[in-house]
Interface confidence: low
């Protein structure tokens, strides 16, 4: 019997260049008569062009929706009704080839061709792309608020904000032919629900989406996006009603930046330079191809690539890489954005060097990628430390914290978080090392205390990069480093003269002079600690809600003891900058740290002084009794305390705490409290300091109140941000 052929709609989008017409501003206004008349003619021409080819039998409908420069560019879409079995045969490439062939066949023809009656179409300027019915619907929904802008070389064009009566707007952007467009988006409100999508073509084609951003992102307050060429579209979808534009858009044409380099590395270890995608930190463009060739001076070395919040992974089944494709020595790897540091180590087996290629495989792109490169010793990649094969990083070994995701840095330890005597491998606690009293059989714990030693897990690194054996030598009144750097920046950690904490006692004025109260509209929200003349440290989760993200809301009080009254030693500050740790993850509480820059420097007094910051190697021994302070609730679910409370807590071994919290405790966390419970931090203490007293009498910041199950519950310890785990970021920001 006869079976009707199944027909399917195939949608195409594209543009063509008209050589005998010129673009005028009238053509940007859809309501103008010039626009109406030009679209009528262009539409007729487009239909005639398609129906002049063998595609004519499949023609269904078409529309010219916009015009641009060049001398005149028409932007259109059309639909063909194709028999299902021919669908794959009529790819955009085939359709473009058929139309170009038709145009070329009539270039020198004197015969009258309907589609050439008014327009001289440039065969080389025809572009056909795959689209969908959904794309056309998206385009049509923006036509009531459609803006075309041409931006010239050397120009930076600020785009007019959206029409708030519309629910969706489209900015159609065009630049000079051989340049690429760079769009800058800056969020100007703390919270919104607006959505912006950027496309690598003139209209909202899903398959050519570069990126989409949503809702006044705090982690990315400024986004710069590169198109692969001189055309781009930005679509806005309205969020909450607002009379203010929650963003500012500006666009500029930029020249193509070559992304190829040949480098010869020096005969030294550690970072030697940076490779990055063009216009970093802009998003890389959809057709980025970088090729970096690095020559290594000797086969003793391997090449290390240190990434920030980006990792390389093997991709199964040849699927395309959605966040950048890498080929390194013929190995194909896919990039993946992560909230962690990562290093790729490339063993070198030949002097020919190493070629690293980076390609954006699909139109969807992401933040620019930057990588530090350098050499490592192939026979000893991590001197004094452990090479974590999972992420390529060197991590402390046998310090009681599983820094490597697979925990191998804490396996096979003869002495964990203790010093191993040379003579007989007995273990002694770290404070006994270089304390002037021999504890090892032949006194090996007291050897090399006055000289430099190889750097390791518990050694302190001096400013001149040499290391000393004595644990925690900072600010103890005795210079241990040759350059004396262990005794620098020591105006910290001393209590003043003084006569959410559960189970605590009231503090007196000047007892905890680094304690900060972070307030919004006169209400205490979080604790914090003064760490430098203009910097207060606190927990990132204090700013979790969008409504808390703006610096203008916050006031920082120092020298405060009572919430309901002021005393002469108390001072207040506004916040000029708020920086959350770039790896902070709300769900896991990882990297729960933020820095507030005060609007003016503190004047130090008996009531206002900074706490000491520990070095990365500072060891806070489990079992040590430390103190937490804050105005948090005195019982779970209770109101905040009027008086600054203090309570002693015991530092808990990481593996014990990790087990209690079902392995949600990361290396950036530290636990303190008692199995008995009772003494703990509570709501309102967040971000406040956990401090431990060194033998010198100075107080060092060990942690920040972060999270925990309830307050003071038996068997559930308080979990704190481990300062030694985030100290490099703190130092990078503060200095």
């Amino acid at each position: 019997g006869y079976k009707a052929e199944v027909m399917v709609s195939q949608v195409y989008s594209g543009s063509l260049r008209v050589l005998n017409r010129h673009f005028s501003q009238d053509l940007t206004r859809r309501e103008s008569s010039a626009f109406r008349s030009e679209t009528a003619k262009a539409q007729k021409m487009l239909k005639e062009l398609i129906t002049s080819t063998r595609l004519g039998t499949y023609y269904n409908s078409s529309s010219v929706y916009s015009f641009g420069e060049g001398p005149l560019t028409c932007f259109f879409w059309f639909i063909l009704q194709i028999p299902e079995h021919r669908r794959l045969m009529l790819s955009p490439e085939v359709v473009q080839a058929l139309l170009v062939e038709e145009l070329l066949s009539t270039v020198n023809s004197s015969a009258a061709v309907p589609y050439r009656a008014e327009y001289e179409v440039d065969p080389e300027g025809l572009v056909i792309l795959e689209a969908s019915v959904k794309d056309i619907a998206a385009l049509n929904s923006t036509l009531g608020c459609y803006r075309y802008s041409y931006v010239g070389q050397g120009q930076v064009l600020r785009l007019k904000g959206p029409d708030h009566l519309a629910s969706s707007c489209l900015w159609h952007l065009q630049g000079p032919k051989d340049l690429m467009l760079k769009l800058r988006l800056e969020w100007t409100l703390a919270e919104c629900r607006d959505r912006l999508a950027m496309y690598d073509v003139a209209g909202p084609l899903e398959k050519r989406l570069i990126t989409s951003v949503y809702g006044c992102s705090r982690q990315e307050p400024v986004v710069e996006v590169l198109a692969s060429g001189a055309i781009m579209a930005v679509v806005w979808k309205k969020g909450l009603h607002s009379y203010y534009d929650p963003f500012v858009l500006s666009v500029q044409p930029v020249v193509f930046q070559a992304c190829e380099v040949n480098l010869t590395l020096d005969n030294r270890l550690d970072s030697q330079g940076v490779l990055s995608t063009p216009y970093f930190p802009s998003y890389y463009s959809p057709q980025t191809h970088c090729s970096w060739h690095l020559t290594v001076p000797s086969l003793d070395y391997g090449l290390a690539l240190w990434f920030d919040a980006y990792a390389l992974r093997r991709q199964k089944y040849d699927l395309p890489c959605t966040q950048g494709q890498w080929t390194i020595q013929n190995r194909r790897l896919c990039g993946l954005r992560i909230l962690q540091p990562y290093a790729e180590r490339i063993p070198v087996v030949a002097t020919a060097g190493i070629t690293i290629n980076f390609t954006s495989q699909i139109s969807l792109t992401g933040p620019g990628v930057r990588v530090h490169y350098g050499l490592y010793n192939q026979s000893d990649p991590c001197p004094g430390e452990f090479l974590c094969s999972v992420n390529g990083l060197c991590v402390p070994a046998c310090d009681g914290v599983k820094d490597c995701p697979n925990g191998l840095d804490e396996r096979n330890c003869v002495c964990r978080a203790t010093f191993q005597c040379k003579e007989d491998s007995t273990c002694i606690s770290l404070p006994k090392v270089c304390d002037g009293q021999p504890d090892c059989l032949n006194g090996s714990d007291e050897e090399q205390c006055q000289e430099g030693v190889p750097c390791g897990t518990f050694t302190f690194q001096c400013e001149d990069r040499s290391c000393v054996k004595k644990p925690n030598p900072q600010c103890d009144g005795r210079p241990d480093c040759r350059d004396g750097s262990d005794e620098e920046h020591c105006d910290c950690g001393l209590q003043g003269p003084s006569s959410r904490i559960v189970g605590g006692a009231v503090s007196s004025e000047g007892e905890w002079p680094w304690q900060a109260s972070l307030q919004v509209r006169g209400r205490h929200i979080c604790g914090g600690a003064l760490i430098a003349d203009r910097w207060v440290i606190t927990a990132a989760h204090c700013f979790q809600e969008d409504s808390m993200a703006s610096t203008v809301l916050w006031t920082v009080f120092l020298g405060k003891v009572w919430q309901n009254s002021r005393w002469p030693g108390e001072v207040s500050f506004k916040v000029s900058r708020l920086l959350l740790h770039p790896y902070h993850e709300e769900d896991s509480h990882d990297y729960d740290v933020a820095l507030l820059q005060l609007d003016h420097p503190v004047v130090r007094s008996a009531a206002v002084r900074p706490v000491c910051l520990p070095a990365r190697s500072h060891f806070f021994e489990p079992g040590l009794h430390c103190w937490i302070t804050g105005w948090g609730a005195l019982r779970e679910g209770g109101p905040i305390s009027n008086a600054l409370q203090k309570v002693d807590v015991q530092l808990i071994p990481q593996d014990l705490c990790s087990e209690v919290y079902r392995y949600q405790v990361t290396p950036r966390m530290l636990c303190a409290g008692y199995r008995k419970g009772k003494k703990d931090a509570c709501q309102g203490d967040s971000g406040g300091p956990l401090v431990c007293k060194a033998l010198s009498g100075r107080w060092f910041l060990a942690g920040l109140v972060s999270w925990g199950l309830g307050c003071g519950r038996p068997n559930y310890f308080g979990v704190y941000t481990r300062i030694t785990g985030v100290i490099s970021w703190i130092q990078q920001v503060v200095t």
Epitope: Q650, R675, K676
Partner: antibody
Framework: QVQLVQSGAEVKKPGASVKVSCKAS????????MHWVRQAPGQRLEWMGR????????TYSPKFQGRVTIIPDTSANTAYMELSSLRSEDTAVYYC???????????WGQGTLVTVSS | DIQMTQSPKSLSASVGDRVTITCRAS??????LAWYQQKPGQSPKLLIY???TRHSGVPSRFSGSGSGTDFTLTISSLQPEDFATYYC?????????FGQGTKLEIK
């Protein structure tokens, strides 16, 4: 200095109960857990249970659950252990000890010999 | 309950010797392990806790190591007053449990 002084030796008949006291000096029992541990002749140490005198919260070893009761008298800075339904295998030296929260028992009483015999 | 097994059960050594006693837990106790010394007719005395931390007043010749399930008590140079019975105890979870003891005798 820290001291735990226990009551004197006891001889009991099977089925009876015994109550041993442990008086602390040099520290406040409310700040610590108070434990009871016993040691039968030639045997290993056996943990019986503990109390948090601050709120009288107790944790007992399943082996002694139902037979042992530990109670505090914070005003006298003393802890008591009562063991009921005595049998001959309960003959042992009973020790009280203190611990700070997570740590093990750092100070012990001198021990009280309880003999169960008919 | 977590079972604690000590070895050896008894040990003869001379003054000045280096002695090692081991303790194995039937499951992971992280570093929550203590060592006690007990002399006849006396109550136990705490030597080491958290596997490696010496209790105040304990001579430096006593040291502890290990984590997870395997632990060691080392006496680097035996003194006459060290001859006693040594017990390990896990303070990881209740009911707290002790090893059966290691009796250290004079050779």
């Amino acid at each position: 200095q820290v001291q735990l002084v226990q009551s004197g030796a006891e001889v009991k008949k099977p089925g009876a109960s015994v109550k041993v006291s442990c008086k602390a000096s040099g520290f406040n029992i409310e700040d610590y857990y108070m434990h009871w541990v016993r040691q039968a002749p030639g045997q290993r140490l056996e943990w019986m249970g503990r109390i948090d005198p601050e709120d009288a919260e107790t944790t007992y070893s399943p082996k002694f659950q139902g037979r042992v009761t530990i109670i505090p008298d914070t005003s006298a800075n003393t802890a008591y252990m009562e063991l009921s339904s005595l049998r001959s295998e309960d003959t042992a030296v009973y020790y009280c000890a203190r611990s700070i929260y997570l740590d093990p028992m750092d100070y012990w009483g001198q021990g009280t010999l309880v003999t169960v015999s008919s | 309950d977590i079972q604690m097994t000590q070895s050896p059960k008894s040990l003869s050594a001379s003054v000045g010797d280096r002695v090692t006693i081991t303790c194995r837990a039937s499951q992971d106790v992280t570093t929550a392990l203590a060592w006690y010394q007990q002399k006849p007719g006396q109550s136990p005395k705490l030597l080491i806790y958290w596997a490696t931390t010496r209790h105040s007043g304990v001579p430096s010749r006593f040291s502890g190591s290990g984590s997870g399930t395997d632990f060691t008590l080392t006496i680097s140079s035996l003194q006459p007053e060290d001859f006693a019975t040594y017990y390990c105890q896990q303070h990881y979870s209740t009911p707290y449990t002790f090893g059966q003891g290691t009796k250290l005798e004079i050779k």
